[in-house]
Interface confidence: low
């Protein structure tokens, strides 16, 4: 069978800011890190201030899908993470403000949120398989799964 | 490789019931959101219903909503689609997919005809 997809039509709009200033932690209890302009990666810290902290935006699909669709942004930037292909780095892509609409190709700025417990999953809008992750060695990437951590602890009111 | 089995469908009187299932194989089901998406006689496919990987996620189209329940089981790498007060419209051949809304493999297909 050849693929096929209903998300060419989709569009995204921009709700709401639903957290402000948070830390993401992987699952070995590194704090995710600038690496550089571009990347990010994730190291154990013992101070959290060095650690990135993140605004997310909600987004509501014109699908109207159950799925809690975000986008990240570092604060008190316009930097934006935006995923590549599986085992890329994610980028941090530069725009003025926040879009208030996404559809088609800028998906790639958008994930899935999931939640279960205290884990948590950033799924790719553009790549509905891969997860935002953190991989030893190597930058904040997208992947399916091990070796790379894939699940991430909220840290709040780390202003 | 990767197959979808589809099983369950045939006639069924309007306000009837009918229970899909769709055998998954060839891929690690529980790392995949899971979709029904069916297709009327001379008609596009419509899709129907998605749900996550961990099950606990749900979306259905608006022709749907209230009469279809979308669920898995990961232990037995098994889709269904437990179909309730069907009407006519709903008949159709109905597919398995494997994604949320964008799909890169469905099965074969089994057909679901509500008639008196």
């Known amino acids: 069978s050849a693929p096929f997809s209903f998300l060419s039509n989709v569009k995204y709009n921009f709700m709401r800011i639903i957290k402000y200033e948070f830390i993401l932690n992987d699952a070995l209890n590194q704090s995710i890190i600038r690496a550089n302009d571009q990347y990010l990666t994730a190291a154990a810290l013992h101070n959290l201030d060095e650690a990135v902290k993140f605004d997310m935006g909600a987004y509501k699909s014109s699908k109207d899908d159950a799925k809690i669709t975000v986008i990240l942004r570092i604060s008190k930037t316009q930097l934006y993470v935006t995923a590549q292909d599986e085992d890329q780095p994610v980028l941090l892509k530069e725009m003025p403000e926040i879009p208030k609409t996404i559809t088609g190709s800028e998906t790639n700025l958008l994930f899935f949120w999931e939640t279960h417990g205290t884990k948590n999953y950033f799924t790719s809008v553009a790549h509905p398989n891969l997860f935002i992750a953190t991989k030893q060695d190597y930058w904040v990437c997208l992947a399916g799964g091990p070796p790379s951590i894939t699940d991430f602890q909220i840290l709040e009111n780390q202003a | 490789e990767v197959q979808l089995l589809e099983s369950g469908g045939g006639l069924v009187q309007p306000g009837g019931s009918l229970r899909l299932s769709c055998a998954a194989s060839?891929?690690?089901?529980?790392?995949?959101?899971m979709a029904w998406v069916r297709q009327a006689p001379g008609k596009g496919l419509e899709w129907v219903s998605s749900i996550n990987k961990s099950g606990a996620l749900t979306s259905y189209a608006d022709s749907v909503k209230g009469r279809f329940t979308i669920s898995r089981d990961n232990s037995k790498n098994t889709l269904y689609l437990q179909m309730n007060s069907l009407r006519a419209e709903d008949t159709a051949v109905y597919y398995c997919?494997?994604?949320?809304?964008?799909?890169?493999?469905w099965g074969q297909g089994t057909l679901v005809t509500v008639s008196s």
């Open positions: 997919a494997k994604g949320w809304a964008s799909f890169d493999y």
């Open positions: 060839g891929f690690t089901f529980v790392r995949y959101d």
